[in-house]
């Protein structure tokens, strides 16, 4: 089944093998003004220098104008994401002009040839924009170019070539191969529009990265770290279809950027927030949930314009499908002491209880070792809005770091069957909500009983708003 890039191996082959594609003429780029949400409506083709189609098709000179730019294709027909995006834009911005840039003839090629064609397509878009600018009331500031995959770099070229500055470019998982590390004039970059926002959903630090890893906009958002998207794993794909393949996984993750953007258009009441962070690991540790100094932003269409001097990398977690929004929490757990822990690494589980709902039992992902007599920071997220948090249930279990350690533990247990139980001592949990920025402190229900052995549970109740406790030193890890 065709995908924007096909499976990784297929793209790798594409980069090297010649491929004959039937094209008898040197075709031009077409601009299809989508005048209806109805996908079967033909729309109108705009023609450079011909004003009549603008009038006949009801082009609104004062309204926002969206140009949707597809990427490389193996099929020569528009994939369904484009239909969804057109429909979502019409729903959200009823008076807007939605133009589909049809460069299928130049995209339905060997990948390397399609890459080489991006410049000429960008130039065609720029010429169309220059011509529109000659019309009364048309403003380049109202133009929003939305490019998917290879189309994101086409948008970059268009923004670079146009006379003046385009209002906004959104890059939806801009293509990686042949663009990673390229000069700013040969790829999408912050200079290409007044505001350039980018969603990265298929980046890989190993193997072939279908999407570009490097930041290329004013804000670069990496949902779920920008690599493995929920609902797109081989297990998910195989589970949902009789004949799943790696191709479907690639398509799912690469195209997820489009669906996140569509979600931001149609689920305005459920905006997803991303948080500035230096890297994915720090985000996974939960230390980047700050909204101070523009450190958080809505993703997709609702992103607030931020023109940073440098690229701003932002992260968030998402659900597996629409609406993608989740609720992020930073959890600070001070482990006061270990007892008889040996080589065992604890894994924590929490259940959050709120005024609206209760969460499932959530594992706390350990990015680094749990430190004793230190504050350990974790990121947890829930798919439902729990409301105001009231209490937390904490459990833990021992997870051996290696088979050798497991054997050591077993041998130790067998030789000393009366070995006293392993325990952790935890007196309080501090929580910060990413979405509300509210900080809360939860204290053990029984202050005299704060030790917890594996499989047992410890309950914490909200004991104060904020984090500062009397006679308490600052936590070891502060928010950015």
């Amino acid at each position: 089944s065709p995908t924007p890039f096909g499976p990784e191996g297929q793209l790798a082959d594409e980069l090297h093998k010649p491929k004959a594609i039937q094209t008898e003429v040197k075709p031009s780029v077409r601009f299809n003004l989508r005048t209806s949400k109805d996908p079967e409506h033909e729309g109108c083709y705009l023609s450079l220098g011909h004003s009549q189609p603008l009038e006949d098709c009801g082009f609104n000179m004062t309204a926002k104008t969206f140009f949707i730019i597809h990427g490389w294709t193996m099929s020569g027909i528009f994939e369904n994401w484009l239909h969804k995006l057109v429909s979502a834009l019409h729903t959200r911005e009823k008076d807007a002009n939605v133009v589909v840039v049809d460069w299928l003839p130049l995209a339905h090629q060997l990948y390397t040839d399609a890459v080489n064609n991006t410049r000429v397509v960008g130039h065609s878009i720029a010429r169309m924009l220059d011509w529109l600018q000659e019309k009364d009331d048309f403003s380049l500031g109202n133009v929003h170019l939305i490019g998917y995959s290879l189309g994101a770099h086409v948008a970059g070229y268009a923004g670079n070539f146009v006379k003046g500055t385009v209002g906004r470019i959104t890059g939806l998982d801009p293509a990686g191969p042949m663009f990673e590390g390229a000069d700013i004039h040969k790829r999408l970059s912050p200079d290409d529009a007044d505001f350039v926002d980018v969603l990265h959903t298929y980046t890989r630090s190993f193997g072939l990265s279908i999407g570009i890893q490097m930041p290329v906009g004013h804000i670069d958002i990496y949902p779920n770290g920008g690599d493995f998207q929920p609902g797109c794993g081989l297990n998910d794909v195989l589970g949902s279809m009789a004949y799943g393949t790696i191709t479907e996984v690639v398509k799912c993750e690469h195209e997820r950027a489009v669906h996140l953007f569509v979600d931001s258009l149609v689920n305005q009441d459920k905006p997803s927030f991303a948080f500035q962070c230096t890297d994915s690991n720090r985000f996974k540790k939960g230390i980047c949930l700050s909204c101070r100094k523009n450190r958080c932003n809505s993703i997709g269409y609702n992103a607030k314009k931020m023109r940073n001097k440098r690229n701003s990398k932002m992260y968030l977690k998402t659900r597996a499908g629409m609406p993608f929004r989740v609720y992020h929490y930073q959890m600070k757990i001070h482990v006061f002491s270990y007892k008889n822990m040996g080589e065992i690494e604890p894994t924590f589980y929490v259940t959050l209880y709120g005024t609206n709902a209760d969460s499932q039992t959530l594992p706390l992902e350990i990015v680094e070792r749990i430190e004793q007599n230190a504050t350990n920071t974790f990121l947890v997220y829930t798919e439902e809005d729990l409301g105001d948090l009231l209490k937390i249930q904490l459990t833990w279990e021992g997870a051996s770091q290696s088979w050798y350690n497991l054997w050591k533990e077993l041998r130790s247990y067998l030789s000393q069957p009366h070995n006293p139980g392993r325990e952790l001592n935890i007196r309080r949990i501090r929580v910060k909500s990413g979405e509300t920025q509210r900080k809360l402190t939860f204290c053990a229900e029984d202050p005299e009983n704060t030790s917890i052995s594996p499989g047992r549970e410890l309950w914490f109740r909200k004991c104060r708003d904020g984090w500062r406790m009397k006679n308490e030193t600052s936590p070891t890890v502060e928010l950015p």
Epitope: G76, H83, S240
Partner: antibody, heavy 120, light 107 residues
């Protein structure tokens, strides 16, 4: 009104090739894709592939791989489907159908069908 | 490839009956499901696109519903001209695939 008119019935020997034409009228030929669907006697419908008349780009069902060739002549708004190395199980009615610009678009108009009989 | 399975394969009914034909996809097809009617010796005709959108000129007694992997075509009150074979087709992924058909016969 939209019309797709196909060429007449053909009888071919195994190993030969057949070329079926589909003439479009009533709409702008380059604004929609043309697909080929076949139906063996008493059987269901099977998608063979499509051509984008705007520039001639094609995509075939893997099942037919190198055996099917789709072309078009925009000057006479006609699409062609050639099936080579014919076998007896290629005996079927071959339809051309118009489809919009998306994967999801339905086949909204069909040709009347061309019967191809492969027999020695 | 996505497999499309229709049931029943054949169905006998009388004029005026309410008839339901189901179509199941082997994976989620995002509501990109179309229904066609075919009479003997004729080309298929589009009835319904995008799960539930009636094609122009199709009588309102035809309706479509469903989501994900399970879809239905309903004829609220069967007319004599409705006796034919009905096919579902997915438009989610290449290659496009059809159900095996449901033959609707007069009882």
């Amino acid at each position: 009104q939209v019309q797709l008119v196909q060429s007449g019935a053909e009888v071919k020997k195994p190993g030969a090739s057949v070329k079926v034409s589909c003439k479009a009228s009533g709409y702008t030929f380059t604004d929609n894709t043309i697909h080929w669907v076949r139906q063996a006697p008493g059987q269901g419908l099977e998608w063979m592939g499509h051509i984008n008349p705007y520039y001639g780009g094609t995509n075939n069902n893997e099942k037919f791989k190198d055996r099917v060739t789709m072309t078009r002549d925009t000057s006479i708004s006609t699409a062609y489907m050639e099936l080579s190395r014919l076998r007896s199980d290629d005996t079927a009615v071959y339809y051309c159908a118009r489809k919009g610009i998306y994967y999801s678009s339905p086949f909204d108009y069909w040709g009347q069908g061309t019967t191809v009989t492969v027999s020695s | 490839d996505i497999q499309m399975t229709q049931s029943p394969s054949s169905l006998s009914a009388s004029v005026g009956d309410r008839v339901t034909i189901t179509c199941r996809a082997s994976q989620d097809i995002n509501n990109y499901l179309n229904w066609y009617q075919q009479k003997p010796g004729k080309a298929p005709k589009l009835l319904i696109s995008y799960t539930s959108k009636l094609h122009s000129g199709v009588p309102s007694r035809f309706s479509g519903s469903g989501s994900g992997t399970d879809f239905t075509l309903t004829i609220s009150s069967l007319q004599r001209e409705d006796f034919a074979t009905y096919y579902c087709q997915q438009g989610n992924t290449l290659p496009f695939t059809f159900g095996q058909g449901t033959k609707l016969e007069i009882k």
